[in-house]
């Protein structure tokens, strides 16, 4: 399987929110021993990886905003925790997954990860990530909305592993 | 503060059983991958099992499969460990700790000592 | 099962000193391998994930390298605090496993 990112770059005015989203592309197992643990964090471009390096998105860690499954595979970080620092992150039965930023802030820009993690009972636990960049900007050069730039489709599907 | 405790270790015959319990403190328990790893007296360490959020996913190294059994009670924020058959070379400190899936052992308990031994 | 090796057994070094550690894997585990310390009577901690990334609190005389099968762990100046037993751990695939450790003594 692979991630797609929709779109590389978000330009958005502060005060405003965004919704950044990643697309787990298939063939996807849906067998009943494997399970899919997606998360979200901040990184950098490095020079050898990019999104290799975990850094909290305002104050929360990947562990906080993974997306726990129920028994219908939508999921949501429905905890309190991510919802006081205006954060939800949430995915639905296509595949699709995101993290909504609230009441953006200039120390909000920044490059964004999405993970994917496959375990399966005794394999190799496959991961694949998505990148993206925000710019929140702020002054008489600010767009009044989010403005988003599709990836090329060689940035969306030449997904490698984390 | 990000804790875990374990409890239940001491001294059982071999044959014996024994239930281990982790309680955690300061993280969202319910939605946390939880494992148990163990070092016997002077040895490495060595990963015993693991256990998904909602207690659905189970993994064990092969030497445990048979013999101990994972689970969680997430309304009491505790993880357990129920070993049966036990022997003599399962003598060691049990710890347990939290493994988010694709990183590292992150958060451990300061361990409980397990001796078996008649 | 994937098998980890760590080189040398022991390190006897002094304070101040360069400390290298190394980790083979039998088989290619990308960059999926961890670092932690254990100090006498405690817990071991992560110190470096993903072979090159430092855990939250490390400090920056931890550095970690390699990938496919080697890897490597410096400590680029000794403190007191640092000599312990230091492991290797493969995320890669269940079985997880460990090296058998590497100890770093004071010379």
């Known amino acids: 399987f692979k991630v797609a990112t929709p779109y590389s770059l978000y330009v958005c005015p502060e005060g405003q929110n965004v919704t950044l989203t990643c697309r787990l592309l298939g063939p996807v197992d849906k067998g009943h021993d494997v399970t899919f643990y997606k998360t979200w964090y901040r990184s950098s471009r490095g020079e050898v990886q990019t999104c290799s390096e975990r850094r909290p998105i305002r104050n929360l860690t990947f562990q906080d905003l993974h997306l726990h499954h129920g028994g219908h595979q939508a999921a949501n970080t429905s905890h309190d925790l991510a919802q006081r620092h205006g954060l939800e992150s949430a995915s639905d039965h296509h595949g699709n997954f995101s993290i909504t930023m609230r009441n953006l802030t200039l120390l909000d820009s920044g490059l964004y990860c999405c993970l994917v993690v496959e375990i399966r009972h005794h394999h190799s636990e496959h991961r694949v990530h998505g990148a993206m960049e925000l710019q929140v900007q702020t002054g008489k050069d600010a767009p009044s909305n989010c403005v988003v730039y599709p990836s090329s489709s060689q940035d969306s599907e030449n997904i490698t592993a984390a | 503060e990000v804790q875990l405790l374990e409890s239940g270790g001491g001294l059982v015959q071999p044959g014996g059983s024994l239930r281990l319990s982790c309680a955690a403190s300061?993280?969202?328990?319910?939605?946390?991958?939880m494992s148990w790893v163990r070092q016997a007296p002077g040895k490495g360490l060595e990963w015993v099992s693991r256990?998904?959020?909602?207690?659905?996913?189970?993994d064990y190294s092969p030497s445990f499969q048979d013999r101990f059994t994972i689970s969680r009670d997430n309304s009491k924020n505790t993880l357990y460990l129920q070993m049966n058959s036990l022997r003599a070379e399962d003598t060691a400190v049990y710890y347990c700790?939290?493994?988010?899936?694709?990183?590292?052992?992150?958060?451990w308990g300061q361990g409980t000592l397990v001796t078996v031994s008649s | 099962e994937i098998v980890l090796t760590q080189s040398p057994g022991t390190l006897s070094l002094s304070p101040g000193e360069r400390a290298t550690l190394s980790c083979q894997a039998s088989?290619?585990?990308?960059?999926?391998l961890n670092w932690y310390q254990q100090k006498p009577g405690q817990a071991p901690r992560l110190l470096i994930y993903?072979?090159?990334n430092r855990a939250t609190g490390i400090p920056d005389r931890f550095s970690g390298s390699g990938s496919g099968t080697d890897f490597t762990l410096t400590i680029s100046r000794l403190e007191p605090e640092d000599f312990a037993v230091y492991y290797c751990?493969?995320?890669?695939?269940?079985?997880?496993?460990f090296g058998q450790g590497t100890k770093v003594e004071i010379k």
């Open positions: 300061g993280f969202t328990f319910s939605t946390a991958w």
């Open positions: 700790a939290r493994v988010p899936p694709g990183y590292g052992f992150d958060i």
């Open positions: 256990v998904n959020p909602s207690d659905s996913h189970t």
């Open positions: 088989q290619d585990i990308t960059n999926y």
């Open positions: 993903d072979a090159s």
């Open positions: 751990q493969q995320s890669y695939s269940t079985p997880f496993t």
